[in-house]
Amino acid sequence: GSGIFQLRLQEFVNQRGMLANGQSCEPGCRTFFRICLKHFQATFSEGPCTFGNVSTPVLGTNSFVVRDKNSGSGRNPLQLPFNFTWPGTFSLNIQAWHTPGDDLRPETSPGNSLISQIIIQGSLAVGKIWRTDEQNDTLTRLSYSYRVICSDNYYGESCSRLCKKRDDHFGHYECQPDGSLSCLPGWTGKYCDQPICLSGCHEQNGYCSKPDECICRPGWQGRLCNECIPHNGCRHGTCSIPWQCACDEGWGGLFCDQDLNYCTHHSPCKNGSTCSNSGPKGYTCTCLPGYTGEHCELGLSKCASNPCRNGGSCKDQENSYHCLCPPGYYGQHCEHSTLTCADSPCFNGGSCRERNQGSSYACECPPNFTGSNCEKKVDRCTSNPCANGGQCQNRGPSRTCRCRPGFTGTHCELHISDCARSPCAHGGTCHDLENGPVCTCPAGFSGRRCEVRITHDACASGPCFNGATCYTGLSPNNFVCNCPYGFVGSRCEFPVGLPPSFPWVA
């Protein structure tokens, strides 16, 4: 502990200028004081001033008022510092002396004489309030006040609690009157060394080094560090824990970048046609009558379906068509005949057969001719056999499809992929993805094109279940399981009913 007993001398009265022994001072009593502070004694005794002692210079002659003085010689109040826990009780002896000698250091002069003395014993609590008193004897009167205060940085009832305000990384606080710490705004903890993070900052996933901050731990993001960061490259997926990539509905693959539901996501089929998914990014459009093209985007003329029979000619109208019938035929589609076999209605060598007791007929056409009267040469392109926008061309009795770039096959039904040039080395499997081909590598190889030989084979331990194929070089775990139909999971360990058209890459 550490504190100061302060004694303020206010007025000393010795009107007759007398000493304690009854003699008078000549020319007057040049007065200084000796103060002795010690532990409480019921009966004050001589002996060491255990709490401290102090002397003053000459403060006046006979009777005088003592002015406050903050520094130098004759300081008032008098200071009696102590370096222990203040016990709350004390004994104080104040002696007034006359000196014939030096004003500044009368204590050292020979021939000093006692004028009077007072003794105070009692209790005194630490505090800023001065206790005022006055002591009289037959010849003199002394007015004074006193108190005990704690030294700088000491607090509490007995000045025993050391506290120094600080604002560094070992504490951010001020000191309360009792010596306890009062944290500065934004700080908490026993030593006020823990910052109070931004309100709502996630307790586990965020932290701070100064108040109102929220620094995210690896794998977390957002103002409050409550959003996980998905796996790098995760396209159509989310996470519940960091570095995860849980695919949104209709997406698959390690990075959820393989579209399993192209129809729903992109609606590629136009004009009311039906869209059917067929694996990653694959789909087919089934057109309504009157439309053609890969996406059924091409509208056919209303006459394109050749609705007029028996050689009738078709004329397009705004929302319909009109059949101009040849002689001997009538009806919306010229389907009704006024002719009989006697009129030789069958062309191109067709045979006439009478029907309805000769009131009508039917023609049996030779090869390569069709129509009610065998009037039409067979057009093998009528059924729109060419897929993906291919152009149909009649070649005598047969027809061929002229495919658009990127398609092949008899009906242009095959997509020529980036994988056609076999970019994957060492037997890697090629997958056409939006941004180009991706190789899944066999055991022992990795890299974009399976060109890197792996010295440590992550697949050697056989981590994939249920007959899945193991590949390395595609994931941070060093291996990837390509699941067979009916199984999912990072190791293909979970059975589930999945469409057989797309093998899951776990």
Partner: antibody, heavy 121, light 106 residues
């Protein structure tokens, strides 16, 4: 009982980077009661505080060295490290790692045995 | 930058009291620590927060700090106390050591 052990090369060439690691055993570096510091002592001279770090990664550096010093922490390994770049012969010293206690007002109650690093070509 | 000044050396007879001072501007408003370092050894904390002793440090080591001066007192000095002594304080977020005092037990 907590012990600290410095490790790293004893010889570094001028203009290169000095790298030291302090491994803490017998206690967790993630304690909220301590900072982990580096102090150096050139031969025959006094102690110089370099800087310290908290387990969260908060760092404090001596302004006279700040431009060249990096202190980092790896809680998974219970280690913290010092990097001092562009060294000169004046950086030759015994380098100590130490534990500074928040309850001790910043006093360093545990020290490593020190490792002498000489900067010379 | 903040500086702490110590006398380069202090001599003391066995059994006597050695006082080592450490001066710095308004040092009394900061907490002072003291370290003992013997030749070829790491420093050892002997006083923290001006006057507190870590466990294992003998009672003959005591400290005080007020005004501009912190003092380490070794009462009843023993030959084993011969060592270099460093004061240390924190100036904001920077640790500052005194230049060190060599205590010789005569």
């Amino acid at each position: 009982e907590v012990q600290l052990q410095e490790s790293g090369p004893g010889l570094v060439k001028p203009s290169e980077t000095l790298s030291l690691t302090c491994t803490v055993s017998g206690g967790s570096i993630s304690s909220s009661s301590y900072y982990w510091g580096w102090i150096r002592q050139p031969p025959g001279k006094g102690l110089e505080w370099i800087g310290d770090i908290y387990y969260t990664g908060s760092t404090y550096y001596n302004p006279s060295l700040k431009s060249r010093v990096t202190i980092s922490v790896d809680t998974s390994k219970n280690q913290f490290s010092l990097k001092l770049s562009s060294v000169t012969a004046a950086d030759t010293a015994v380098y100590y790692c130490a534990r500074e206690g928040v309850p001790l007002g910043g006093g360093a109650d545990k020290w490593g045995q020190g490792t002498l690093v000489t900067v010379s070509s | 930058s903040y500086e702490l000044t110590q006398p380069p050396s202090v001599s003391v007879s066995p059994g006597q009291t050695a006082s080592i001072t450490c001066s710095g501007q308004r040092l009394g408003d900061k907490y002072a620590s003291w370290y003992q370092q013997k030749p070829g050894q790491s420093p050892v904390l002997v006083i923290y927060e001006d006057s507190k002793r870590p466990s294992g440090i003998p009672e003959r080591f005591s400290g005080s700090n007020s005004g501009d001066t912190a003092t380490l007192t070794i009462s009843g000095t023993q030959p084993m106390d011969e060592a270099d002594y460093y004061c240390q304080a924190w100036d904001r977020d920077t640790g500052v050591f005194g230049y060190g005092t060599k205590v010789t037990v005569l």
